[in-house]
Structure formats: C-alpha cells, structure tokens
Interface confidence: low
C-alpha cells in the first residue's frame, strides 16, 4: 500500500533580508484527507507559521490554491524576511479527527539561514606594464557574503587558470564575509586583446556567477622590433631610408633620425598601422640627399617606447658612384 | 619555406586516445609570431578548428572538444602534438596541422598534408 | 560560436564566368575573415585574408569584399584549375569557425 510523503527538498534555504523565501512541500497523496499546516521548529514550543482554516499569516501567501482537492503543492512564501525569520520549517500534514485533527506526518525540514551576495568582483592588475614570457599578478576581491563558503575561479581568454591564491576572511563566525585572490599569468605576445577573468560562484547567486575583468591591455607591454632599409630606388639627388617598427605596444612611440651622430629636426613621413593582435606597426621614411662629399653617411634610427630606454638601428648608406652620377628621377 | 607533416597511427580504438604529431622542419616553433593549430576534416565535410599552442605552452581549445582534447609542444624537438581521448568513429577525420600567424596574413598560411585516422575496432 | 553561412553550397559554371559565393556570419566580425581553396585530396590553401587581401602568390582573378556580417568572395573569370571547394573562416573569435563551404564545378 501506497504511503503519503511529505517532500521537502531543499535541506537548507539561504535568503537576503527583505526579499521573499519560497519553502516548498509536496505531498505524494491527497488520503488521508486532512489540512497541512507549516510549523518552525519542532516540540510542544514549535511556532505555527500558516494554517489555511484558521489565523491571520500576513506576510504568508501559498504557492498553489489550497482550496482545490486535488491539490498536492502546499508551498508557501514569506515576504519581507528578517533576522528572525531564521529557522528550521516543517509541513505537517493532520489527519481529519473529531474532536479536533491528529498529527499524521512531518515532512524532514527546510533550514532557512540568512545569506548575503558577494559583491561585483574587482579585479585590478600590476602597476606598471611588463613584457610577453613575464609573469603578472592580478587580484580579485568580493565583499558581504554570506555564508562563507564560495567558490572563486581565473580564467584567461575563456581558460580556466590553476596559477592562484585565493583567501576567505575572517576565518571564524561572521555576519559577512570577504574573498581576497591573487593569480599569477603569464603573458602572451597577443595579449593585448586578452582578457583575465576572475569568476566568483556562491549559493546566493543561485547558479550565475558574478565576474570581474582586467585587460591585459593595462599590463603588457610588447616592446618594438626595429629594421632600417635603403630603398633601391632613388628620386633624383635624394635615397630614401626607412625605419620600420613593428608589433609594439601600448602606441605611445618617439622616434628620431640621426644623420653621423646629429639629430635631424626635418619633418618625416610616417604612418601607423594596427595588427590583428593589437600590436601596432610604425613605418617612418627619411630622405637623403646624395652628394660626392657624402660618402660615409651613417643614419641611426632611435625609437623610445612608452618611457623605456631608448633602442636604435643603424644603416651605413651605400651610395655607388653609378648612383651618384645618375641624373634622372627614378633609378633603381 | 616553413613545412609541416602530420604523423600518428591511422587507425584507432573506440574508447582509446588518438595521438598525432607535427614536425616542423625549415622554421623554429620558439622563434614566435605564430601559433600551432589542429583543424580536422571529417570525410566529405567541412573544417573543424580544434585548438591552437603557442611555443610558450599557452593553449586554446574548441569548447565542443575541449574535455578531450590535449595540445602539446616540444621545442627541442621542433614538434607539436594533439592528443584526443575517449574517440568515437566520430572522431574518424583527416586531422590537419597549420600555423596561424598572429599579424599580417592571419590565416593558416602553413598547412601540413593531413593525415586520415579512422577509429574502429 | 560565430556562425558562418556560406552560399550556395555548390555550383557550376563555365570557364570565364564570374563566380560569386557568399559569407555570412551570425554576429560583426569586422574584417576578420579568410577564404579558402580546397582541393580534392589536399590540404586548404589561404587565397584571401583580412577579407579583401590577396595572399602572396594567389591570381589576381580571385577577390574578396565585405565587412561586418557579410563577405563576397569572387572569381572574376573562371578557369579549370579552379575546380575546388571554398571556406570562408572566421578568427575574430575564438573558437575560429570554418563556413560548410562551396563546391565550385565546371559545367
């Protein structure tokens, strides 16, 4: 033979202060017939929290429509929750008797505890930019949870990553909580376009972990690689010499041309172009004018890159006396 | 000019872990400015991108794969690896290597031949 | 994953037609599209990347266009030789993802 149970499947229920908890019962059987009533605590001194015939529940409404006979859901919702609302609740279901109902059965209990959400994570990053194969440190913080047990996750470009140091304080009882985390990432030459994740997962959030990010736009620097090239062709008395850097970053770039040692003040062509991995390249183009006294020209190309030390490339012109004594415009 | 060749058993287990390797001759995987990839081809189908390693180790993987998927990279021997466990005759593909520049012509502008690995008993 | 739709899924045409086949992505990938030559046994070749540029050593009759969601990828005059199947791949995202491709065939 079939026997009633009283289902109620959430052991421990976490609520925020002022919001509404939904304590669920079900019930597997509508015999024998009788009301099911909602209690907190258990004994002689349990406290009666709704009763559908008799009573004013204020802040109790029920989930499904009780009046209906075939109803099994005896689920309710307390508003407005409070410190004092903590507790452990039972449906009970009551056997119709005369002169007055017999307690038939309990269902095992819904612990409601207070809980708190953390806050948006924070993730901040190092202070000063460092270069790709360098490791960096990222840190994370979430504040006012409750309770204290929480899950917090890295992640780099959507990979989980295992480099970190995650604390929870305090360390005994507490109102709330904080979470403190540190990981430690390697960088990429294209990590001007990554992102550090920091993902922080706790049973108030019911399942949609709050997440902080850093670019490691912020800390990276990609240092440029320079090539100084005399172009074959010459236009009249004039080489032109070019100065490429490449896959720099952040943009922030000075460049200088040199002639034997003097630097030039003349205005140079340039363009700046963008690399798919945020990189940028800068092209820089200096006119020579050729002259038979102008036989050991030595051009330097000096590029300072966001505040570091200057770095320099050196070409010795190759100037022919073929080329010397060409007259038209453009001679290879 | 950089070339790649795949090479690993062409004939797998069910259940078993496919391995394959790609040797990269008149280039260095260390020297940078690319990454390794894995694209699979099933037969008569399209491309499947699998996952990518940098000569650093730093990898990324497809999402669909990626709780099977391994990418490996040994400089010294100028090789990189895929690894993909618990195969199913699925998994029966032409699995292609390539490098992946990171500026410049971003595509898989080095392709291996491709190697056929069916899986069956 | 970003969704490339390629059309039509096959095709045929005479040598010296204009072949046009067509991209499109599920969400903006800007320019961040290759196309791809596949032959019968081979591995794929890069014939266009960044959308609309011609890798070294590719004829010129091949072209690319296009931006954001939508990428046209041309033969301006058919020839034998082009007889292949054509991706398009995106890399703005990772994953990279491949279109279902285009068979193209001389009639």
């Known amino acids: 033979e079939e026997e009633l149970q009283m289902i109620q499947p959430e052991k421990l229920l976490l609520v925020t202060v002022g919001k509404t908890a939904t304590l669920h019962c079900t019930v597997t059987s509508l015999l024998p017939v009788g009301p099911v009533l909602w209690f907190r605590g258990v004994g002689p001194g349990r406290e009666l929290i709704y009763n559908q015939k008799e009573g004013h529940f204020p802040r109790v409404t029920t989930v499904s429509d009780l009046t209906k006979r075939n109803n099994m859901d005896f689920s309710i919702r307390i508003s407005s929750i409070t410190p004092a609302d903590v507790g452990t609740y039972y449906c009970v279901k009551f056997r119709k008797g005369s002169p007055e109902n017999v307690e038939f059965k309990s269902g095992p209990g819904t612990e409601m505890a207070l809980g708190a959400k953390p806050s948006a994570p924070v993730v901040l990053g190092p202070a000063a930019r460092t270069t790709p194969e360098h490791t960096v440190s990222f840190t994370c913080e979430s504040h006012g949870f409750s309770p204290r047990d929480i899950t917090l996750k890295w992640f780099k470009n959507g990979n989980e990553l295992s480099d970190f140091q995650t604390n929870v304080d305090p360390t005994g009882q507490s109102v709330a909580y904080s979470i403190r985390s540190t990981a430690r990432v390697v960088l990429d030459p294209w990590d001007v376009r990554s992102q550090v994740i920091c993902e922080v997962a706790h049973v108030t959030l019911q399942g949609d972990p709050l997440r902080g990010t850093a670019n490691l736009s912020e800390a990276i620097r990609v240092p440029p690689t320079l090539e100084v090239t005399q172009q074959p062709m010459r236009v009249g008395n004039q080489v032109n010499v070019t100065c490429q850097v490449r896959k720099f970053y952040p943009q922030s770039l000075q460049l200088t041309w040199s002639e034997n040692g003097n630097v030039c003040q003349r205005e140079t062509a340039s363009t700046l172009t963008e690399n798919k991995d945020g990189t940028y390249n800068w092209t820089s183009w200096f006119l020579v004018n050729i002259s038979d006294q102008r036989d050991d020209v030595v051009l330097t190309c000096q590029v300072k890159h966001d505040g570091q030390l200057a770095v320099s490339k050196r070409l010795a012109l190759e100037v022919t006396v073929h080329q010397k004594d060409q007259s038209s415009d453009a001679t290879p | 000019q950089v070339q790649l060749q795949e090479s690993g058993p062409g004939l797998v287990k069910p259940s078993q872990t496919l391995s394959l390797t790609c040797t990269v001759s008149?280039?260095?995987?260390?020297?940078?400015?690319?990454?390794w990839s894995w694209i699979r081809q099933h037969p008569g189908k399209g491309l499947e991108w699998i996952g990518y390693?940098?000569?650093?180790?730093?990898?990324y993987y497809n999402p669909s794969l990626k709780s099977r998927v391994t990418i490996s990279v040994d400089t010294s021997k100028n090789q990189f690896s895929l690894k993909l466990s618990s195969v199913t005759a699925a998994d029966t593909a032409v699995y292609y290597c390539?490098?992946?520049?990171?500026?410049?012509?971003?595509?898989?502008?080095?392709w291996g031949q491709g190697t056929l690995v069916t899986v069956s008993s | 994953d970003i969704q490339l739709t390629q059309s039509p899924s096959s095709l045929s045409a005479s040598v010296g037609d204009r072949v046009t086949i067509t991209c499109q992505a599920s969400?903006?990938?800007?320019?961040?599209l290759n196309w791809y030559q596949q032959k019968p046994g081979k591995a794929p070749k890069l014939l266009i990347y960044?959308?609309?540029n011609l890798e070294t050593g590719v004829p010129s009759r091949f072209s690319g266009s296009g931006s954001g969601t939508d990428f046209t990828f041309t033969i301006s005059s058919l020839q034998p030789e082009d007889i292949a199947t054509y991706y398009c791949?995106?890399?703005?995202?990772?994953?990279?993802?491949f279109g279902g491709g285009t068979k193209v065939e001389i009639k």
């Open positions: 960044d959308a609309s």
């Open positions: 969400q903006d990938i800007s320019n961040y």
């Open positions: 008149g280039g260095s995987i260390s020297s940078g400015g690319y990454y």
């Open positions: 791949q995106q890399f703005a995202y990772l994953p990279y993802t």
């Open positions: 390539a490098r992946e520049g990171l500026d410049g012509s971003y595509g898989s502008s080095a």
């Open positions: 390693i940098y000569y650093s180790g730093s990898t």
